[in-house]
Every structure is written in C-alpha cells, then in structure tokens.
Interface confidence: medium
C-alpha cells in the first residue's frame, strides 16, 4: 500500500509517542557514542519534520524514503568522523548503499562506561523533575549498549520501567520496592537483547530462508492446534517483522508487529487456545505476551507420520512439485508433535530429511532408498538428550558458581585464544543454564537448554566476529546455525595452543574487592580462573580446585584483616608462588 | 482465510458431461489436498473424490463415480476440477469443494476445513 509520504504514514500509525521513541532508539543504535541531548537534538527535528508532512504530504521533502531522512539526519553530526572514524563514509554512499553502511558498523561491543545505578533518592528525584528526559535516557542508554536490541519490545521495558518508578518512588521503603523491579528488568531486558541477536544474526548471516524454518519450527511447536496454512502465513508475517528490526527499520517493525498481533487475535481461534489473556491486554504488552505465550495442547489424533513422508509413493513428487512447502509441512508436523525437542534439534532433522531425498529422489528406488530415514534421527535427539541429562547432574552437584567453573575450564581449554572477559562472559551465561532448565521436567528441558545455548554461543559468535582470532570460532560459528552447539561441543583441548607467558600483575589483587558484590567478586576470580588455564591448558581439574579454593581463602582471610591491602600484597605473593609451585608453572 | 468458489454446474441430459471447477484464494493453495463432495436432497453428504497436496498425483473417488468422474488440479490458478463423465440422474445434487490442511489426501469431511457454498448439478432422464 503506497503513501505520498512514509514518514506522515508511520507517524500516523504510531502516534507521536512512540514515533520518537522509536526515532531515539534507532538514532542510539546507529550512532552508539553520540551524547544524549545530540540524540535528542535531532529526533526533534526529525519529529517537527514529520508534523509538518502529516499537516501536508505534498510538503518538500515528504516523498523520501525513511531511510533517505534519517540518513541525511545522522549524517548531519558534527563530530562524525572524529567520534567513528570510517563510520563517516557511509555518508558519501546513495540509499540503500548508506543503511547497510550504517547497520556493518553496528558494535555489539560498544567502549562504553558500564551503567551505574546511582541511589534511590537521586533516580527517585530525576524521575519526578523531568519524567519524559528520565524514559527517554534509558531507552538511549539501553539502545546505544544493545544495537540490535528488538525496538517495539523495548518500548514494552520503557513502560515497565516507568511503572516501577511511579509506584516505588511513592513507597515508604522505596529502595526495597523499586531495586528488585530493577534487577528484574535488567535480567529480562539482557535475556531480550541477547535472542533478538540471534534472530538477526540467523537473518543477516545464514538468510531469510533459515528464519523462516526456525520460525515453522518454533510457531508449529506453540500453535499444534493451526493449520499449516496459518503457520505459514504468521512465519510469513513474523519473518518481515524482524527482517525489518533488524535492518534499522523499527518504524515499520512497530507497525507490522502490532499488525501481526491484531490479526494473530482476531484470529485466535484458529492459531491457539492460549491467547485468550493476552489478547486481553494493550498493545505492547499485548504483543510481548504473545511472544511468550505457553504451547498449546497438542490435538488427540495426529496420524502417524511416516505415512505421509516415508511410505507413501508420492514423497518424491511432492517434493519435486515445491520443494520448500513439502520440507515445510514435514517441519511443521514434526515440530507441533514435538514440544520436547530444540527448535535446533527439529531443524536437524528437517536437513537431515531434505539430504535424504535429495540423495534418494535421484535414486533408481527412491522408496528403498529413503524407507529408513526416520533411523536416521534417533542419534541426532539422543546426542543433546544425553548431554542435558550429563550437564544437569554436574549442575545439580555443583551448584551455579562452581558449575559455570567448570565451563570456564573447559571452554578456555577449546578456544583459549578468545579474550578473558569474552569467555568469562559467556561461560557465566552458559552455566546459567543450569538454573534456568535443569529444574524443568524431562519434556521442557531439551528445548529450554538447547534454545538458550543456541542464543548464548551465539553472542560468543558475534563478539568473536568483530575482532576473530580462533580459527575453530570462525568454524562453528559460520558452517551450521542449528549445529553450532554440537560444534562446540565436539571441540577437545586446543593442542596447537601455545600457552600464555606468566604476568604476576594477572593474579595481583586489592582490597577494593572486598567492596564488591558477590557477583562482581565472582567476575574477578572467574577471570583469574580463565587466565590460570591459560597459562597452564594442561592443569588438571584437581590443581584448577586446589588453586581456586586457595585463592577464596585469601580474599575470604584479606577482607577480614585490619590491614587490608598489606594482607593483598604480602599474602598475594604468597599465594602465587604457592600456585606456580602447584601447577608447576 | 481460505476462500473456496465453485462454479460449472447446471442441467445437463444423462450420458453427458460437465466441467466442475473450484478456485481458492487468501493462502498458499499448494498446500492443501482439495475434494469435492455432494449432498442431495434429503441425503446426508457424500464423499465424491479427492486429490492430494503439492503435485496431485494422488486422487481417491468414491465407488459410485470411479471410472467416470476425473478430479485434477492446476496449482498455478488456485483452481482443481472434476470432470464428470456419463452423468447418471443419481448424480443430481449439489456439488461442494473443500479444502484440507490436515491430511496429504482425505475422504472424510471432518477432515476438511474450508468449504465453497456449492454449485448445483442437475441430470435429467
């Protein structure tokens, strides 16, 4: 449906409000280093720009794409080249040419200061001095750290957050009510950030095509109830939603997906009996419900599958006659059977499948030949079944801490050339798996574990990718999107590695960590951890332990010294030598 | 949703011919098996043939009509047809299309889930 003007049609659709929040956010996804008032300073224009198109489409200017618009906006910045560097030359480029430029220069890995939470009383303050300055620096401060943060959901955390304030900061005890709303967000909002990267990354990096299959896979699991048709046409909607999120085009984005969310209501009797509620709701949360909403019940009857995609005569012409409807269908029925398999696992055995006939369908009997495809599969749902089962008994022994421990180890051991913080990080967000899926039933656990895997490695992937330096990353990363995890898995000990010369100052501390949280003093023996194996890949578990448990004891006996830095320094060099001597170094 | 119009009925001598054709639009017709059924007047309505998704080179008829009635499909029209030879006065009623996500191919109406509102076929003696 063709408008005379874009910018007039979407301020329209959205409303002011969200308009420029959304302007903000993918202005602060692009520029991630500009200031705030920066930022500000020009979605206003760009918002007065829109009112007057609204007033008049025929107005100048009017007719261009949005990208033309916000492009010219942001190549208006002063300090382009200072502040980006080759950033700037984008501006020389014609659209569409320009937004791609801008969007290969997105940093998953901004230099930017970590967020500190200032005190109650002073955000509380804030928050009543200026409430439309305080929402507005969030969604800045979110955005410019998480460029490909999803924008529609993010207007949702907008919400929510400003909830929190209007409530807490009226409370008699305003820190107890608004800090735990705040850790919430932040865990939630992380989580949120971390899956629309993989959704982008499955568009940008392996194409539409594999969206699209993950989406049959993971909608036909939710929606067994719908007919392949319906699920077609909501992976069909879904997949321009995010195509668009993930191109820079969040106007478009907000729009479709409240589209999507009407027409998935309207027609809620056909998709799921489980929308009820959240069709119930307003709009962002109505959509974000959506997206979380709990599988429904499989229907009582299904036949059998291997009727329709192994004995029937007609497999290889149905398959001939479209190739990709046929592979859909056989996702779709397999997937909506199977709520207890990954999503990555059901793409799995759709590839394995779609090999198969490929192989047979040129054979001289294509029935014998595919007959026994379904044997096929029984290794590829036992291997992760197997390994959840492993890793959940090593959770439960050890508990979080010691069991992302024990990832450390062993993923600094396969790609110890990785930087420290980088396998910190994601060992951190591996173990919590654990916590996440280990406490699930055996039929939720596959997908729970394997899914959140699958978005873990893969910011491992993309923050590898802006500065690569493993080979064997490079690998796992760009063969397979669905055997990424098995990828990783099946890689031993880095034998070519040659280890890291020793540097006391690595494994000197402070006294400022006794100040810290428990989560940041975890961080700080974690990253010790990484560099110990570092040093030593060959050191066995047993040493790693002794090390670690005598290093706790130090910090533990340091922070409870009167002289606490004396007791660092003279203790810490203790300590080292003791460990050199116990790992041989 | 699947939209589903028939058309091509009409009073026709028995011993001839007609042409029924039933087009779908609003989803991917692909992937859908297609059947026509009949109801006549007073009767329950009766499975008269089916033909599967993707290709079509499944069809099934009910055993009144084998031998004479052809069902066929053309994916690029969105369009399946059931040719209908040696036209017996039994054969008068009214003839529905219906289209069915749940099975490759399927006679039993509980299967089907999108209907046409029926084209009349009339066969005089």
């Known amino acids: 449906d063709a408008h005379k003007s874009e910018v007039a049609h979407r301020f329209k659709d959205l409303g002011e409000e969200n308009f420029k929040a959304l302007v903000l956010i993918a202005f602060a996804q692009y520029l991630q280093q500009c200031p705030f008032e920066d930022h500000v300073k020009l979605v206003n224009e760009v918002t007065e720009f829109a009112k007057t198109c609204v007033a008049d489409e025929s107005a100048e200017n009017c007719d261009k794409s949005l990208h033309t618009l916000f492009g010219d906006k942001l190549c208006t910045v002063a300090t382009l080249r200072e502040t980006y560097g080759e950033m700037a030359d984008c501006c020389a480029k014609q659209e569409p040419e320009r937004n791609e430029c801008f969007l290969q220069h997105k940093d998953d890995n901004p230099n930017l200061p970590r967020l500190v939470r200032p005190e109650v009383d002073v955000m509380c303050t804030a928050f009543h001095d200026n409430e439309e300055t305080f929402l507005k620096k969030y969604l800045y401060e979110i955005a410019r750290r998480h460029p490909y943060f999803y924008a529609p959901e993010l207007l949702f955390f907008a919400k929510r957050y400003k909830a929190a304030f209007t409530e807490c900061c009226q409370a008699a005890d305003k820190a107890a009510c608004l800090l735990p709303k705040l850790d919430e967000l932040r865990d939630e909002g992380k989580a949120s950030s971390a899956k629309q990267r993989l959704k982008c990354a499955s568009l940008q990096k392996f194409g539409e095509r594999a969206f699209k299959a993950w989406a049959v896979a993971r909608l036909s699991q939710r929606f067994p109830k719908a007919e392949f048709a319906e699920v077609s046409k909501l992976v069909t909607d879904l997949t321009k939603v995010h195509t668009e999120c993930c191109h820079g085009d969040l106007l478009e984005c907000a729009d479709d997906r409240a589209d999507l969310a009407k027409y998935i209501c309207e027609n809620q009797d056909s998709i799921s009996s489980k929308l009820k509620e959240c069709c119930e709701k307003p709009l962002l949360e109505k959509s974000h419900c959506i997206a979380e909403v709990e599988n429904d019940e499989m229907p009582a009857d299904l036949p059998s599958l291997a009727a329709d995609f192994v004995e029937s005569k007609d497999v290889c012409k149905n398959y001939a006659e479209a190739k990709d409807v046929f592979l859909g269908m056989f996702l779709y029925e397999y997937a909506r059977r199977h709520p207890d398999y990954s999503v990555v696992l059901l793409l799995r055995l759709a590839k394995t499948y779609e090999t198969t006939l490929e192989k047979c369908c040129a054979a001289a009997d294509p029935h014998e030949c595919y007959a026994k495809v379904f044997d096929e599969f029984k290794p590829l749902v036992e291997e992760p079944q197997n390994l959840i089962k492993q890793n959940c008994e090593l959770f439960e022994q050890l508990g979080e801490y010691k069991f992302q421990n024990a990832l450390l180890v062993r993923y600094t051991k396969k790609v110890p050339q990785v930087s420290t913080p980088t396998l910190v990080e994601v060992s951190r967000n591996l173990g919590k798996v654990g916590s996440k899926c280990c406490k699930h039933p055996e039929a939720k656990r596959m997908p729970c574990a394997e899914d959140y895997l699958s978005v873990v490695l893969n910011q491992l992937c993309v923050l590898h990718e802006k500065t690569p330096v493993s080979d064997r990353v490079t690998k796992c990363c760009t063969e397979s999107l669905v055997n990424r995890r098995p990828c990783f898995s099946a890689l031993e000990v880095d034998e070519t590695y040659v280890p890291k010369e020793f540097n006391a100052e690595t494994f000197t501390f402070h006294a400022d960590i006794c100040t810290l949280s428990e989560k940041e003093r975890q961080i700080k023996k974690q990253t010790a951890l990484v560099e110990l194996v570092k040093h030593k890949p060959k050191a066995t578990k047993e040493q790693l332990k002794a090390v670690m448990d005598d290093f706790a004891a130090f910090v533990e006996k340091c922070c409870k010294a009167d002289d606490k830095e004396t007791c660092f320094a003279e203790e810490g060099k203790k300590l080292v030598a003791a460990s050199q001597a116990a790992l041989g170094l | 949703q699947l939209q589903v119009v028939e058309s091509g009925g009409g009073l026709v001598q028995a011993g001839g011919s007609l042409r029924l054709s039933c087009t779908t639009s609003g989803r991917a017709f692909i992937g859908y098996a297609m059947g026509w059924f009949r109801q006549a007047p007073g009767k329950e309505r009766e499975f008269v043939a089916a033909i599967s998704w993707f290709a079509g080179d499944t069809t099934d008829y009910a055993n009144s009509v084998k031998g004479r009635f052809t069902i066929s499909r053309d994916n690029a029209k969105n369009t399946v047809y059931l040719q209908m030879n040696s036209l017996k006065p039994e054969d008068t009623a009214v003839y529905v299309c219906?289209?069915?996500?749940?099975?490759?191919?399927?006679?039993?109406?509980?299967?089907?889930?999108?209907w046409g509102q029926g084209t009349q076929v009339t066969v005089s003696s």
């Open positions: 219906a289209a069915s996500s749940a099975r490759p191919l399927s006679s039993r109406s509980d299967e089907y889930h999108y």
